[in-house]
């Protein structure tokens, strides 16, 4: 049982407004319908789940309401987007990506997306 | 597809010794294996994690007194512990991870459950004093 290679990006800069897109492609081994894609933080020491979806292959990625993620699919890619973050939440962001069905079930993780977060400078007062 | 079959486990006395282990199916060599344990109440720790090149990691708190090691002959992992302590008492679960990037810092990292998705069914481990 070979490992399914997941690949993404090894750096990325998120924007001025807190946004960071990121491509996360798998070599799927079978015909999968149903893929589970998650989302987790590694920083100091601690792994935590930034956001999960499972969907269907040829349908759009279903996130929580409450979700900072959001994605499409296409083929065996995915096109993730992670918004609201701060300086704070800089860290490696890792894709985890499992074929739900048919089985056998695969599983593969990514080697992570090491995000900067830069918050910008407030502005100025002016006396204009 | 992985599968994982644990046995071993037990009680035992502390200062006393037991053996894990946990035979590995449809594994593929550049999968990080490990052991875990966890407590009622409490979320699953990595005890110890063996990569594909044989380097080993051991948590803080088994150093010295856990040995990890992997058959290739019988594709069996092992979990040698010796001088154990009531406060090992736990659920033992084997583990394989798919990226062998993340095995040796697993020990360290809170959440590194994550990084396995194949788990063995678990064996309870009761030391007493």
């Known amino acids: 049982c070979k490992a399914m290679h997941v690949a993404q990006p090894a750096v990325v800069l998120a924007s001025s407004r807190g946004i960071a897109s990121f491509v996360c492609e798998y070599a799927s081994p079978g015909k999968a319908t149903e893929v589970r894609v998650t989302v987790l933080r590694q920083a100091d020491s601690q792994v935590t789940e930034v956001c999960a979806a499972t969907y269907m292959m040829g349908n759009e990625l279903t996130f929580l309401d409450d979700s900072i993620c959001t994605g499409t699919s296409s083929g065996n890619q995915v096109n993730l987007t992670i918004q609201g973050l701060r300086a704070m939440d800089t860290g490696l962001y890792i894709c985890k990506v499992e074929l739900m069905y048919p089985p056998p079930y695969y599983l593969g993780i990514g080697n992570g997306t090491q995000i900067y977060v830069i918050d910008p400078e407030p502005c100025p007062d002016s006396d204009f | 597809q992985v599968q994982l079959v644990e046995s071993g486990g037990g009680s035992v006395q502390a200062g006393g010794s037991l053996r894990l282990s946990c035979a590995a199916s449809g594994y593929y060599n550049r999968y990080c294996l490990g052991w875990f344990r966890q407590t009622p109440g409490k979320e699953r720790e990595a005890v110890a994690t063996i990569d594909t090149d044989g380097s080993t990691s051991y948590a803080d708190s088994v150093k010295g007194r856990f040995t990890i090691s992997f058959d290739n002959a019988k594709n069996t992992l092992y979990l040698q512990m010796n001088s154990l302590k009531p406060e090992d008492t736990a659920m033992y679960y084997c583990?394989?991870?798919?990226?062998?990037?993340?095995?040796?810092?697993?020990?360290?990292?809170?959440?590194?459950?994550?990084?396995?998705?194949?788990w063995a069914q678990g064996t309870q481990v009761t030391v007493s004093s």
């Open positions: 583990a394989a991870g798919p990226n062998p990037r993340y095995c040796s810092g697993a020990v360290n990292t809170r959440g590194a459950e994550h990084y396995f998705g194949y």
